[in-house]
């Protein structure tokens, strides 16, 4: 079996700044080098919009749902059919392949399984799933996710998103 862990599941970054989404894994055996697949899924709800209207009816409903199910995350838990899903990058051995949508972007998988954006862009906000599979169990469900929010330089949103912390601001 393969155990996949994302040690820091929340990231807030300023537009055009770099960010690395860390992912680690442990394998019980090494049949062949594992395949690392990073997938992007759009948020089920707009996190930034909710941050600016915390008293909305929807947010109150979400709070009630979360109270009944402490593990419920309304931004992440919805069917793929109602959101955008893309392969960001895959890594097999030392070869990294970008998904079609990300061709030309300065994105790579560094280390064993970390996803690195040299420069974030509008549209990068969402949920990133790190999946690690063996060559002979490609459909294995061994994944963990990180949420990424990309904010404009003038936004005050980082202060309004409890549980998130902004990454270093670099020029």
């Amino acid at each position: 079996a393969i155990q996949v862990t994302v040690p820091d599941p929340y990231h807030v970054v300023i537009l055009f700044q770099p960010v690395t989404l860390h992912c680690t894994y442990q394998m019980s055996n090494t049949l062949t080098a594992p395949i690392v697949i990073w997938k992007y899924k759009s948020f089920c709800r707009d996190r930034v919009a909710d941050a600016f209207s915390p008293a909305s009816v929807d947010n109150q409903l979400n709070a009630q749902l979360a109270a009944g199910n402490p593990g419920y995350n309304p931004y992440v838990e919805c069917q793929d059919s109602v959101r955008t899903v893309r392969v960001v990058a895959t890594k097999q051995g030392n070869a990294v392949t970008l998904g079609d949508y990300y061709q030309g972007r300065r994105i790579t998988i560094t280390g064993n399984a970390d996803l690195t954006f040299e420069q974030t862009a509008w549209g990068d906000s969402g949920v990133y799933y790190c999946s690690v599979v063996s060559a002979q169990d490609l459909d294995g469900n061994n994944e963990a996710y990180a949420e990424l929010i990309v904010l404009g330089r003038t936004s005050e949103a980082p202060e309004l998103l409890p549980g998130f912390r902004a990454g270093p601001l670099e020029d």
Partner: antibody, heavy 115, light 106 residues
Framework: AVTLDESGGGLQTPGGALSLVCKAS????????MQWVRQAPGKGLEWVTG????????RYGSAVKGRATISRDNGQSTVRLQLNNLRAEDTGTYYC????????WGHGTEVTVST | ALTQPASVSANPGETVKITCSGG????????YGWYQQKSPGSAPVTVI????QRPSDIPSRFSGSTSGSTATLTITGVQVEDEAVYIC?????????FGAGTTLTV
């Protein structure tokens, strides 16, 4: 040595159900996706269904979707195919196969669906 | 469905290449295997899996490669006992897919 032994084939009646079992040995069973592939007489190979190593994910070919169920018991190193509402076109040799891109095959078990 | 030539022929000692195309990617990559069937109804034997991996009991004259969505099986120094049907298979989002097979006559 890797071995995959299928059982459960034979003469079946249309509309009935069959249960095929594949017993695996010689490898770390839970690390491999397992597949069922069939071959009708005089025809090519047809993928039927597959199940991930943990058993958490299953997929089915269009010809059997809604009629087939694949399951596995990692403790017993077995994978089972249940196929309901049998049709004449389900006739053929059913192979158990190891891996996402298959690296080992069983000897096959023949299934005949006929009145 | 996967596309491969219906038949190829070669003399012993020659190099044979069989191509397979039409597969779809799975999570951004392509995954192919090659299977040898010596007679109808006999169990297939894997000669290449995971694009270019060869099972330990398969002779080194068999090799596999991929370029984009096309896979190639190469038999370097083909032998009479290699005469068989070679079937390519791939792994994609919808499940497994096989080609109709290529009959190799030596």
């Amino acid at each position: 040595a890797v071995t995959l032994d299928e059982s459960g084939g034979g003469l079946q009646t249309p509309g009935g159900a069959l249960s095929l079992v594949c017993k695996a040995s010689g490898f770390d069973f839970s690390s491999y996706e397992m597949q069922w592939v069939r071959q009708a007489p005089g025809k090519g190979l047809e993928w039927v269904t597959g199940i991930s190593g943990s058993g958490s994910s299953t997929r089915y070919g269009s010809a059997v979707k809604g009629r087939a169920t694949i399951s596995r018991d990692n403790g017993q190193s077995t994978v089972r195919l249940q196929l309901n509402n049998l049709r004449a076109e389900d006739t053929g040799t059913y192979y158990c196969a190891r891996g996402s891109t298959i690296d080992a095959w069983g000897h096959g078990t023949e299934v005949t669906v006929s009145t | 469905a996967l596309t491969q030539p219906a038949s190829v022929s070669a003399n012993p000692g020659e190099t044979v290449k069989i191509t397979c195309s039409g597969g779809s990617s799975y999570a951004g990559s392509y995954y192919y295997g090659w299977y040898q069937q010596k007679s109808p109804g006999s169990a297939p034997v894997t000669v290449i899996y995971y694009n270019d991996q060869r099972p330990s009991d398969i002779p080194s004259r068999f090799s596999g490669s991929t370029s984009g969505s096309t896979a190639t099986l190469t038999i370097t120094g083909v032998q009479v006992e290699d005469e068989a049907v070679y079937i390519c298979g791939t792994y994609e989002d919808s499940g497994g897919v096989f080609g109709a097979g290529t009959t190799l006559t030596v």
